[in-house]
């Protein structure tokens, strides 16, 4: 988790002097509770936005937006803590809005936004906005949280972001797999425009089961420039095991931008359809 400095970290708006600060996610009001605390945020919204840096690189960011409730507690609102928690790693990053002037009611509801948290493809986050100071122990909670799922690199908008392109999202291998005679598979795919090697990982399974009955790895050396964007054809020999008929072919590239961690593409060959066994015809007719 990190912040993108594609624009100045600003939280001031007409009628409010405010500054954005790094936060340890442990506000002082946890340790020194206050008697009077503000109410919770209202209408917290999280959206996927896209930000180009000064150099033009494109990153997905979480656009966080919320409003204030129209009660007297805004007189005691000193700021807000924004927290983003990546659910699969438990990594958390926080920033603090510090109000340098007192809020007053005005003709429009107060609204705040922040679009600087860079999010990763195919990750889920919990976004929390805590109004400050935080409540006393057993006080009513004054935060709002929402979960936010970021699409993966297959998503059209995500595909062209820098993190997705770095993992090889623009490569479409268009894999085809056909079963040949004599227990063989022919795998064909389109090479990318980089002199890098590939690996074909074959895993075979019985008809209706998920434990593998055969595994094989095939190395494809780096293509020459004249072979870029051409089809590569590989014939793989299968183990002659009856019923080991469902094959998953996975192609792993080793592009310089992602090395061992590039997006893999796969194709599956199903077991051949078994013809329905016809009912046996009795060779005599019962007379009763």
């Amino acid at each position: 988790l990190r912040l993108l400095d594609h624009r100045a970290l600003v939280c001031s708006q007409p009628g409010l002097n405010c500054t954005v600060k790094n936060s340890t996610c442990l506000d002082d009001s946890w340790i020194h509770p206050r008697n009077l605390t503000p109410s919770s945020p209202k209408d917290l919204q999280i959206q996927l936005h896209f930000a180009h840096t000064q150099q033009g690189d494109l990153f997905p960011v979480a656009h966080i937006e919320w409003t204030l409730q129209t009660d007297a507690s805004i007189l005691y609102l000193e700021g807000a803590e924004l927290s983003v928690l990546q659910l699969n790693t438990n990594e958390r990053l926080c920033v603090r809005f510090e109000f340098l002037s007192k809020l007053r009611h005005h003709h429009r509801r107060w609204r705040f936004t922040f679009s600087h948290f860079v999010v990763d493809p195919d990750q889920e986050y919990e976004v929390t906005v805590h109004h400050l100071p935080k409540p006393i122990p057993d006080g009513d909670p004054n935060h709002q949280s929402k979960n936010f799922l970021v699409p993966d690199c297959e998503h059209a908008r995500m595909k062209v972001t820098t993190p997705c392109m770095s993992s090889g999202s623009l490569w479409d291998p268009n894999i085809t797999v056909e079963t040949l005679e004599a227990h063989q598979l022919r795998v064909s795919f389109t090479l990318w425009n980089e002199s890098t090697h590939y690996q074909i990982l074959l895993t075979s399974f019985p008809h209706m089961e998920n434990h593998s009955c055969f595994e094989h790895m095939h190395h494809i050396p780096a293509p020459r420039p004249e072979e870029f964007h051409q089809r590569s054809n590989v014939t793989l020999t299968l183990r002659n095991l009856k019923g080991c008929c469902r094959h998953q072919v996975q192609i792993q590239p080793f592009f310089s931008s992602c090395l061992n961690d590039c997006l893999r593409h796969s194709a599956t060959v199903s077991c051949p359809e078994m013809p329905d066994t016809p009912e046996p015809i009795p060779d005599y007719m019962p007379l009763w």
Epitope: H6, R7, Q47, L48, H49, F50, A51, H52, T53, Q54, Q55, G56, D57, V61, H63, S115, R157, M165
Partner: nanobody, 126 residues
Framework: QVQLQESGGGLVQPGGSLKLSCAAS????????MTWVRQAPGKGLEWVST?????????YYADSVKGRFTISRDNAKNTLYLQLNSLKTEDTAMYYC??????????????????KGQGTQVTVSS
């Protein structure tokens, strides 16, 4: 100070072509990503295309213009270009060139732009 001056707009029939230019000054042009945004009558600012700074500049396009518009830059001339082909009536808008960072939502509605020029009008009509 940063100056961005667009030119090349005009009236064109559907299916026609135009080439927009943007002359930049007041900053190190080659060090910045550059963008084209547009604003149709009565609508908000819409992101169109961005080109990276640096060698082998990466280009990005909104879905609605992909395959029809081409962004390019000439760092020696401090100029940004946008070639508009197969124009449609819905491409009618004021086109602006923008410098540096920009932020937009999933529908390409611009939320923030660092700096943009005065714009050049493109009208597609029969």
């Amino acid at each position: 100070q940063v100056q961005l001056q667009e030119s090349g707009g005009g009236l064109v029939q559907p299916g026609g072509s135009l080439k927009l230019s943007c002359a930049a000054s007041g900053f190190t042009f080659s060090s910045y990503g550059m963008t084209w945004v547009r604003q149709a009558p009565g609508k908000g600012l819409e992101w169109v295309s961005t080109i990276n700074s640096g060698v082998g500049s990466t280009t990005y396009y909104a879905d609605s213009v992909k395959g029809r518009f081409t962004i390019s830059r000439d760092n020696a001339k401090n100029t940004l270009y946008l070639q508009l082909n197969s124009l449609k009536t819905e491409d009618t808008a004021m086109y602006y060139c923008a410098k540096g960072s920009i932020e937009y939502d999933s529908d390409y509605r611009v939320n923030y732009v660092e700096a943009k020029g005065q714009g050049t009008q493109v009208t597609v009509s029969s």
